[in-house]
C-alpha cells in the first residue's frame, strides 16, 4: 500500500497531550524507533506521570481515505464491555506548510489528531521543493513552533554590515523564487533555503535537511547544508552551511530581524530573536470564550449562538446534522437531548443521535488553531458515545454577516469532523510590523524609542505655542500603543499618539504601518486616529532626524492643522541614524549613535581560560587577552587541544579590539597556527557577544561546523546596552 | 608505537654542566609539545621545562626553581630533545624523564648524580 | 608558591569505586589548571592517565575517569583492580608552570 503523504514520510512527528503529560510519537509511513512500543508501532504514546509506553497504533494496521487516517491495534480497550481495540486517528487538512500534528482528544479506545499540513491539499500550490519539520517540544512538553515564520515566497534578507553581498534565508523550508516580485532572488538556484547574492549572482549556500532542534531551554537550531559536492570559489575549499539559532527574547520587547553573526569560510551563523522562538501556550476553556494575555489572543464565539428554534445545518451524505453553538440545537426532534450536535438519518428522520452535549464542551486555541469539541453524545454501536469536532477558520469576508456556516468534512469511528470559516474566528495576533526602515543595505532601527511597560514613561512632546492655561499634552510611543499611565491613563487603548487636555483625551493615530525612509529622514505615519470631522480620521506624521549620540531628546510638534486632523512632529534622535559598525580598543566599543557603551574587560580572565569541550576537541579562550594554559602559545587569545593526544593549535593572537554592530560585539583573533592549505592561511577565531540579561558573565559556546571555522558565540549580560 | 629514551645522566661535580637527550620514535615530533620532568629518590615528580609544538611557535616555559640555569630545546629533523644544565647542584640529583605532552607518555629515565 | 595537595594513601577492595582528589592551595581548581594524573608502579613506571582535567590518554581503561569536584580535580577508579595498586600523583597548571602533588599511595586489597 502506497504511502497517503510521502512528504510527511522522512521524520518521527511529536505531538502532546498537555493535560495528562503524554508525549506522542508518530511515523505516518514506517514505524517509529522506539523499542519500548515494539516493532511495527505507528503511533506510540509515552505517558510521562506513569513512565509507560503503548503502542496505539500499528503501521501494518493502516487505512487512509483522502483526509483521514487510521491506525489500529490488536490491544482491546475497556469500553463498556465491548471488544473493541485502541486506535488512532489522524484528521488531514489542507495547510501552508508540513505543518505539526495537533493532539485533539483521546477516549478509551481512540487517540484524535488533526494535522493542517500540504500534504492534505487538492493542488500543489504551496509545496515546497524541500522542507522540514519546524517545531519541537522542550522537556516540559511545551511546543516551540516556528510555522509562521515561513515563508511561501520571497526570503528574509539578513542583517549584515557587509555592503557587498546579501545573504537571503527562509524558515524551514527552501526559498520560492518563483513567486516573489523581488528581481534579488530570481537568480536563486532551486532548493536553496539560504540565497547567498553577491553583484548579480546567486548562489546556494544551504538546503534543508534535518528539523528544528532544540539545544537549550528557548533557544533553537536549524541547520542547513550544501548538498552537491561542487565548492564555491569564495570559500576556500569549504563547504557552505549555515546554522540559524532562534532565541526567545528574555522580556516581549526585544524580537528582531536576523542577524549575522559570523561567516568565515562560508559558515555562516545567523541569530534571530523572535517570539516565535518562546513556548506557545494551549489556551483551553469550557465556554464559549477565551483569552490569553500571553499569547494577546482574545476569542468570543458567543455572536455564532442561534436563537428561537433555528440551528446551523450541515450535509453529511447520509445524515443532517443540526448544530449549535454556546447552546443546545432548538429543533424540535432534538430538543430532549442537550444536543449541541445533532445527527439526523435522512432516510428515517426519527433516527435522531445527538453527536456532542453541549454542556460537554472544551474550546481549544493552540498554534493559531481554533477547535471546539462536544463530546458525551449518544452511543454507538460500538459503545462509544459520539463526539463532534469543529475546526474553526478565519475568513473576515464569510457570508452569513460574517458568521459563516459549518461544513461536514467526514466521520471517524462516530466522531464527526466539521470545518467552519467565520470572522469570529480571527484571532488578534501579535504585530508583525518592522519598527525600523531599510534603504537599500542601509538599516534604520527605531526599537530603542519604543516604550513597552511600566516603570517605563511614553515620550511627551514639546510644543513651545501653547500658554499653560490651555496646555494640551501630547504622548507618543513608537511602533507601540502609548502606554495607559500618568497622564496618558484615559487615553484610548491603540492609540499611538495621544493629545491630553482639560476636556479629555484624543486618540491622534495608530501604529498600522512600518516606519520609511523619505528625503534623508525616517518617516513614522500614524493614522486611524479619531473622527475629526467629514468622515475623516485623525492622521500623525513623525519626521525623525539623525543626531548621533542622543536617546534623551524628546519629539517636537511642528505643526497641526486640516480643521484638527492633522499633526506633524519632528524627533532629532540617535535612532534615526544608519547602523554602522564602530571599533574599539582596552575591550570597550562605544555606540556613539546610541550613545551606548560597551565594556567586556569583566570577561578577560588574567590566569587561565575559558574551557570548550566539543567530542574531539577542547577550546581554551580568553576575551581581550592571552590564554595561559600548559599547551597554548602565551600570547593566544584562543587554543585547540586534541582530546586524544593533546596536539595543539595557535587559534589567533590575542588583542583588545572590540567592534560593534547593531546590537552585537565581536572579538577577532588573527595570525594562528597556518592551514596545511596551498595558502598557509592562519587560523582565526571570532567571537561574537549577544545580549541576555539573565546570562552574567555567560559562557563561550562553540558553533562546531567543521576543521577550520572558529566561531564562538557567547551570550552574556554584559553585551546588554544600559537601559535609557 | 609512542617511545622515549632518555640519555646523557650519570656522575658530575656541583657547578658542572650536563646535557641530556631524548630520542622520539613512533610520532609526529613537531606536533606535540614535549617536557622534562625528574624524580628525586622518594619523593615526588617534579616539572622542570616544556617547549610547545610548532603550531604554537616552539615557546618555552620553566620552573622557577631552575629558570636561568636550565635550557630545554629541541632538534626537530632528528627527532630529539634536549636539556641543558649549568651549575648542577647536589640537589640536582634526581632521574630525569623525557615526557610528551601533559605527561601521557613517559621515557624510562636518566639518573643524574651531582657530588663532590 | 602554589601547593598540590593529594590524600597521602587511600584503601580499596576489588571491584569498589575509589575517588583521588587534588586541591590547590590558593583556591578553586577550574578548568584552567589543566589537571592531570599520572600512575607510577614499581621501578618507576610512569603512565599517563589523564589529561587537560577530563581527557583519557589512548589506551587507558575506561575505569579511570578525571573530573572537577567541589572545586578539586578528581581521580575516579570505577571498579578497582588489584593491578590498580600504585602511586598516583596529580599536577596543576599555575599560568606558566605545572606544580606536581606529593602523590597518593592506592591500596587494593
Known amino acids: 500500500q502506497a504511502a497517503p503523504f510521502p512528504e510527511l514520510c522522512s521524520y518521527t512527528w511529536e505531538a502532546v497531550d498537555t493535560k495528562n503529560n503524554v508525549l506522542y510519537k508518530i511515523n505516518i509511513c514506517g514505524s517509529v524507533d522506539i523499542v519500548q512500543c515494539g516493532p511495527s508501532s505507528a503511533v506510540c504514546m509515552h505517558d510521562l506521570k506513569t513512565r509507560t509506553y503503548h503502542s496505539v497504533g500499528d503501521s501494518v494496521l493502516r487505512s487512509a481515505t483522502r483526509s483521514l487516517l487510521e491506525f489500529n491495534t490488536t490491544v482491546s480497550c475497556d469500553q463498556q464491555g465491548t471488544n473493541h481495540r485502541v486506535q488512532s486517528s489522524i484528521a488531514f487538512l489542507c495547510g501552508k506548510t508540513l505543518g505539526t500534528p495537533e493532539f485533539v482528544t483521546a477516549t478509551e479506545c481512540v487517540h484524535y489528531f488533526e494535522w493542517r499540513t500540504t500534504a492534505a491539499c487538492k493542488k500543489d500550490i504551496f509545496k515546497a521543493n524541500k522542507e522540514v519539520p519546524c517545531y519541537v517540544f522542550d522537556e516540559e512538553l511545551r511546543k516551540h513552533d516556528l510555522n509562521p515564520l515561513i515563508k511561501l515566497s520571497g526570503a528574509y534578507l539578513v542583517d549584515d554590515s557587509d555592503p557587498d553581498t546579501s545573504l537571503f534565508i527562509n524558515v524551514c523550508r527552501d526559498i520560492d523564487t518563483l513567486r516573489d516580485p523581488g528581481s534579488q532572488l530570481r537568480a536563486c538556484p532551486p532548493g536553496t533555503a539560504a540565497c547567498l547574492v553577491r553583484g548579480h549572482q546567486a548562489f546556494d549556500v544551504g538546503q534543508p535537511r534535518d528539523g528544528l532542534k532544540l539545544v537549550r531551554k528557548d533557544r533553537l537550531v536549524l541547520s542547513y547544508v550544501r548538498e552537491e559536492a561542487g565548492k564555491l570559489d569564495f570559500c576556500d575549499g569549504h563547504s557552505p552551511a549555515v546554522t540559524i539559532t532562534f532565541v526567545c527574547p528574555s522580556e516581549r520587547r526585544e524580537g528582531t530581524i536576523p542577524k549575522l553573526t559570523a561567516k568565515s569560510n562560508c559558515r555562516y551563523e545567523i541569530e534571530w530573536i523572535t517570539e516565535y522562538a518562546c513556548h506557545r501556550d494551549y489556551l483551553e476553556s469550557k465556554t464559549c470564550s477565551l483569552s490569553g494575555e500571553q499569547q494577546d489572543v482574545s476569542i468570543d464565539l458567543t455572536p455564532l449562538a442561534q436563537s428561537g428554534g433555528s440551528s446551523y445545518i450541515s450535509d453529511g451524505k447520509e445524515y443532517l446534522f443540526y448544530l449549535n453553538v454556546c447552546g443546545e440545537t432548538e429543533i424540535q426532534f432534538c430538543n430532549k437531548k442537550q444536543a449541541a450536535v445533532c445527527q439526523v438519518k435522512k432516510s428515517d428522520t426519527s433516527q435522531v443521535k445527538a453527536a456532542g452535549r453541549y454542556h460537554n464542551q472544551t474550546l481549544r486555541y493552540s498554534d493559531g488553531d481554533l477547535t471546539l469539541i462536544y463530546f458525551g453524545g449518544d452511543e454507538c454501536s460500538s459503545g462509544f458515545q459520539r463526539m463532534s469536532v469543529i475546526n474553526f477558520e478565519c475568513n473576515k469576508t464569510a457570508g452569513n454577516d460574517g458568521k459563516g456556516t459549518p461544513v461536514f468534512t467526514g466521520e471517524v469511528d462516530c466522531t464527526y469532523f466539521f470545518t467552519w470559516d467565520t470572522e469570529y474566528a480571527c484571532v488578534k495576533e501579535k504585530e508583525d510590523l518592522l519598527c525600523g526602515a531599510t534603504d537599500g543595505k542601509k538599516r534604520y532601527d527605531l526599537s530603542a524609542l519604543v516604550r513597552h511597560a511600566e516603570p517605563e514613561q511614553n515620550w511627551e512632546a514639546v510644543d513651545g505655542s501653547q500658554t499653560e492655561t490651555e496646555k494640551k499634552h501630547f504622548f507618543i510611543n513608537i511602533c507601540h500603543r502609548v502606554l495607559q499611565e500618568g497622564k496618558a491613563r484615559g487615553c484610548p487603548e491603540d492609540a499611538a499618539v495621544c493629545a491630553v487636555d482639560k476636556n479629555g483625551s484624543k486618540n491622534l493615530g495608530k501604529f498600522i504601518s512600518s516606519p520609511m525612509k523619505e528625503k534623508g529622514n525616517i518617516q513614522l505615519s500614524y493614522s486611524d486616529g479619531d473622527d475629526c470631522g467629514h468622515g475623516k480620521k485623525i492622521k500623525t506624521n513623525i519626521t525623525l532626524v539623525c543626531k548621533p549620540g542622543d536617546l534623551e531628546s524628546a519629539p517636537v510638534l511642528r505643526t497641526s492643522g486640516e480643521g484638527g486632523c492633522f499633526y506633524e512632529f519632528e524627533w532629532h534622535t540617535a535612532a534615526a541614524c544608519v547602523l554602522s559598525k564602530t571599533e574599539g580598543e582596552n575591550c570597550t566599543v562605544f555606540d556613539s549613535q546610541a550613545g551606548f557603551s560597551f565594556d567586556l574587560s569583566p570577561l578577560t580572565k588574567k590566569n587561565g581560560a575559558y574551557k570548550v569541550e566539543t567530542k574531539k576537541y577542547d577550546f581554551y579562550i580568553n576575551v581581550c587577552g592571552p590564554v595561559s594554559v600548559s599547551p597554548c602559545q602565551p600570547d593566544s587569545g584562543a587554543c585547540q587541544v586534541a582530546k586524544s593526544d593533546e596536539k595543539t593549535w595557535n587559534l589567533g593572537l590575542s588583542n583588545a579590539k572590540l567592534s560593534y554592530y547593531d546590537g552585537m560585539i565581536q572579538l577577532n583573533y588573527r595570525g594562528g597556527t597556518p592551514y596545511n592549505n596551498e595558502r598557509h592561511t592562519p587560523r582565526a577565531t571570532l567571537i561574537t557577544f549577544l545580549c541576555d540579561r539573565d546570562a552574567g558573565v555567560g559562557f563561550p559556546e562553540y558553533q562546531e561546523e567543521d576543521n577550520s571555522t572558529y566561531n564562538f558565540r557567547w551570550y552574556t549580560s554584559y553585551a546588554c546596552p544600559e537601559e535609557p | 608505537e609512542v617511545k622515549l629514551m632518555e640519555s646523557g645522566g650519570g656522575l658530575v661535580q656541583p657547578g658542572a654542566s650536563l646535557r641530556l637527550s631524548c630520542a622520539a620514535s613512533g610520532f609526529t615530533f613537531t606536533d606535540y609539545y614535549m617536557s622534562w620532568v625528574r624524580q628525586p629518590p622518594g619523593k615526588a615528580p617534579e616539572w622542570l621545562a616544556l617547549i610547545r609544538n610548532k603550531a604554537n611557535g616552539y615557546t618555552t616555559e620553566y620552573n622557577a626553581s631552575v629558570k636561568g640555569r636550565f635550557t630545554i630545546s629541541r632538534d626537530n629533523s632528528q627527532n630529539i630533545l634536549y636539556l641543558q644544565m649549568n651549575t648542577l647542584r647536589t640537589e640536582d640529583s634526581a632521574t630525569y624523564y623525557c615526557?610528551?605532552?601533559?605527561?601521557?607518555?613517559w621515557g624510562q629515565g636518566t639518573l643524574v648524580t651531582v657530588s663532590a | 608558591q602554589a601547593v598540590v595537595i593529594q590524600e597521602s594513601a587511600l584503601t580499596t577492595s576489588p571491584g569498589e569505586t575509589v575517588t583521588l582528589t587534588c586541591r590547590s592551595s590558593t583556591g578553586a581548581v577550574t578548568t584552567s589548571h589543566y589537571a592531570i594524573w599520572v600512575q607510577e608502579k614499581p621501578d618507576h613506571l610512569f603512565t599517563g592517565l589523564i589529561g587537560?582535567?577530563?581527557n583519557r590518554v589512548p589506551g587507558v581503561p575506561a575505569r579511570f575517569s578525571g573530573s572537577l569536584i567541589a572545586d578539586k580535580a578528581a581521580l575516579t577508579i570505577t571498579g578497582a583492580q588489584t593491578e590498580d595498586e600504585a602511586i598516583y600523583f596529580c599536577?596543576?597548571?599555575?599560568?606558566?608552570?605545572?606544580?606536581f602533588g606529593s602523590g597518593t599511595k592506592v591500596t587494593v586489597l
Open positions: 615526557v610528551r605532552g601533559g605527561f601521557a607518555y
Open positions: 599536577a596543576l597548571w599555575y599560568t606558566n608552570q605545572f606544580i
Open positions: 587537560g582535567t577530563n
